[in-house]
């Protein structure tokens, strides 16, 4: 009779993760008695998958009933496979013996892959704000695929980006693999609206990549522009001054007019405009009695936007082309913000 | 920390079916390699296992109570359950809720213990 | 099912005394499925030696365990009072799981 050969059909196995992986394994006899065992990989530190004669497997079931006499078919099933199940797999016959079962023949193996999807890409940026004709970095991870081969692109708003750098670690062989990558974005006064987006593709994903995006609302400061202007007198001793603050972003703003150095109100930025490109305008205006001043006035509108330091526009108030009114001893009038913006 | 505890009534009448609860905390069974499982000991006896189940919902059972117990797992709630039919006054114990981790290499044991529920079977 | 006889019932002994407690299987066993737990009175077991020879978590070092095939050992070096409980060994070879009737060690 011929000699039993331990017969594994299947050079190679790839199974998803979450799925089940079958094994196929067979003998070509039922001599000599004894039982199968499986083992993921060879040698001394081989690690027993499975053993017919004992022990308890939970993620094994076998293909076929094995307390039958006649039964040849060893195959098995291994469920809820994860990257850490690859490797390659013998089937191995044990010859009954005394105290211990002796190891009489192994199957060729079979290499199993495992492909795992990546996890949705994480983009973070920047912790502080930057504003304009910066240049900031933005970073993207992906974690637990599997095969190492993957892709990474990176967009603003829908313009692909070549200002990059990407890692796969480990760089050796692995259950499964990290991508991380740093791209830098210069940024522009229009940003507000704009969205940084990586993307990722891999053999897992059939052609639908995976997308993480950041706003660049998050990561962008757009300074003020300020003009201060004097309106049409309102009335023989009154002039109205507007500070007209423009295209800013973020909306956090506070407001604060000094006649010739001295504070004479503050106020934050509550009812703002909002342009096209996302940015504020907004206007504060100060009613001035010029009868209570001998001399020339200089107004200034000084701005502190989004905790960075004030800046600040004057304007000159000539007192001497106005006519005085006597007893008159206000020099402004509290009068809040106006509504109405001028552009 | 890992806690079990089992809850059920105390007394059964014969016939009847036994239901017990144990809930547990400090880990989830939705972990690989974690099982839930009873262990019983009628008094001034000896251990005996009934049944468990693995993360993977795979049971095990007792072939001598087989036909009689059934055990199921609810992991959003963080409970196993233990349902004993037909019982006679053979089936008084301390039934014990414990967890079983598995290592591999087919090896399983019993890591963390209840405090145990006693159930007495009398009409 | 594989049945595990425990010896002896019950051991008397004192303290700082050295404990030997057998247990034997039915059939053969790998040594990697072979358990020990304690039991001390109006409480629930817990696991005190895995794999024939591994000391759980928190086990002091005077417990140890040895065996092969068949036959199997628990030996306490040198006993304590905290120590005096009843022993089980059990088998997660095959299944049914299966307790040995369990050795009392008590006072002398």
């Known amino acids: 009779e011929e000699e039993l050969q331990v017969i594994q059909p299947d050079k190679s196995v790839l199974v998803a993760a979450g799925e089940t992986a079958t094994l196929r394994c067979t003998a070509t006899s039922l001599i000599p008695v004894g039982p199968i065992q499986w083992f993921r990989g060879a040698g001394p530190g081989r690690e027993l998958i499975y053993n017919q004669k004992e022990g308890h497997f939970p993620r094994v079931t076998t293909v076929s009933d094995l307390t039958k006499r006649n039964n040849m078919d060893f195959s098995i099933r291994i469920g809820n496979i994860t990257p850490a199940d690859a490797g390659t797999y013998y089937c191995v016959k044990f010859r009954k013996g005394s105290p211990d079962d002796v190891e009489f023949k192994s199957g060729a193996g079979t290499e199993l892959s495992v492909r795992a999807k990546p996890s949705a890409p994480v983009v973070s940026g920047p912790a502080a704000r930057a504003t304009p004709q910066h240049t900031v970095s933005f970073t993207c991870e992906s974690h637990g695929f599997s095969p190492r081969d993957i892709t990474l692109k990176w967009f603003k708003n829908g313009n692909e980006l070549s200002d990059f750098q990407t890692n796969v670690d480990p760089v050796g062989e692995s259950v499964s693999y990290s991508i991380h990558s740093t791209a830098k974005v210069v940024l522009t006064r229009e940003d507000v609206h704009s969205q940084v987006i990586c993307e990722v593709a891999h053999v897992t994903l059939q052609g639908d990549p995976l997308r993480g995006t950041a706003n660049l609302s998050e990561t962008i400061r757009v300074p003020p522009t300020l003009e201060v202007t004097q309106q049409p007198v309102r009335a023989e001793n009154q002039v109205n001054v507007t500070c007209q603050v423009r295209k800013f972003y973020p909306q956090r703003l506070q407001l604060t007019w000094l006649e010739n150095g001295n504070v004479s109100r503050t106020e934050t930025a509550s009812t703002v405009t909002e342009n096209k490109d996302g940015t504020y305008n907004w206007m504060s205006w100060l009613l001035v009695n010029v009868s209570a001043h001998r001399d020339d006035v200089k107004l200034t509108c000084q701005v502190e936007h989004d905790g960075q330091p004030a800046v600040s526009k004057s304007h000159d108030l000539k007192v001497s082309a106005h006519p005085k009114e006597q007893g008159s001893n206000t020099a402004a009038e509290n009068t809040g913000s106006n509504e109405r913006n001028i552009y | 920390q890992v806690q079990l505890q089992e809850s059920g009534p105390g007394l059964v009448k014969p016939s009847e079916t036994l239901s017990l609860t144990c809930t547990f905390s400090?880990?989830?069974?939705?972990?690989?390699?974690?099982?839930m499982g009873w262990i019983r000991q009628p008094p001034g006896k000896g251990l005996e296992w009934i049944a468990h189940i693995w993360w993977n919902d795979r049971e095990y059972y007792n072939s001598a109570l087989q036909s009689r117990v059934t055990i199921s797992k609810d992991t959003s709630k963080t409970q196993v359950s233990l349902k004993l039919s037909s019982v006679t006054a053979a089936d008084t114990a301390v039934y014990y809720c414990?967890?079983?981790?598995?290592f591999g290499s087919g090896q399983a044991w019993f890591t963390y213990w209840g405090q145990g529920t006693l159930v007495t079977v009398s009409s | 099912e594989i049945v595990l006889t425990q010896s002896p019932g019950t051991l008397s002994l004192s303290p700082g005394e050295r404990a030997t407690l057998s247990c034997s299987s039915s059939s053969t066993i790998s040594s990697t499925y072979l358990h020990w737990y304690q039991q001390k009175p109006g409480q629930a077991p817990r696991l005190l030696i895995y794999g024939t020879s591994n000391l759980a978590s928190g086990i002091p070092d005077r417990f140890s365990g040895s065996g092969s095939g068949t036959d199997f050992t628990l030996t306490i070096s040198r006993l304590e009072p905290e120590d005096f409980a009843v022993y089980y060994c059990?088998?997660?070879?095959?299944?049914?799981?299966?307790f040995g009737q369990g050795t009392k060690l008590e006072i002398k």
């Open positions: 059990q088998q997660g070879s095959r299944i049914p799981f299966t």
């Open positions: 414990v967890r079983i981790d598995y």
């Open positions: 400090g880990f989830s069974l939705n972990t690989y390699d974690i099982g």
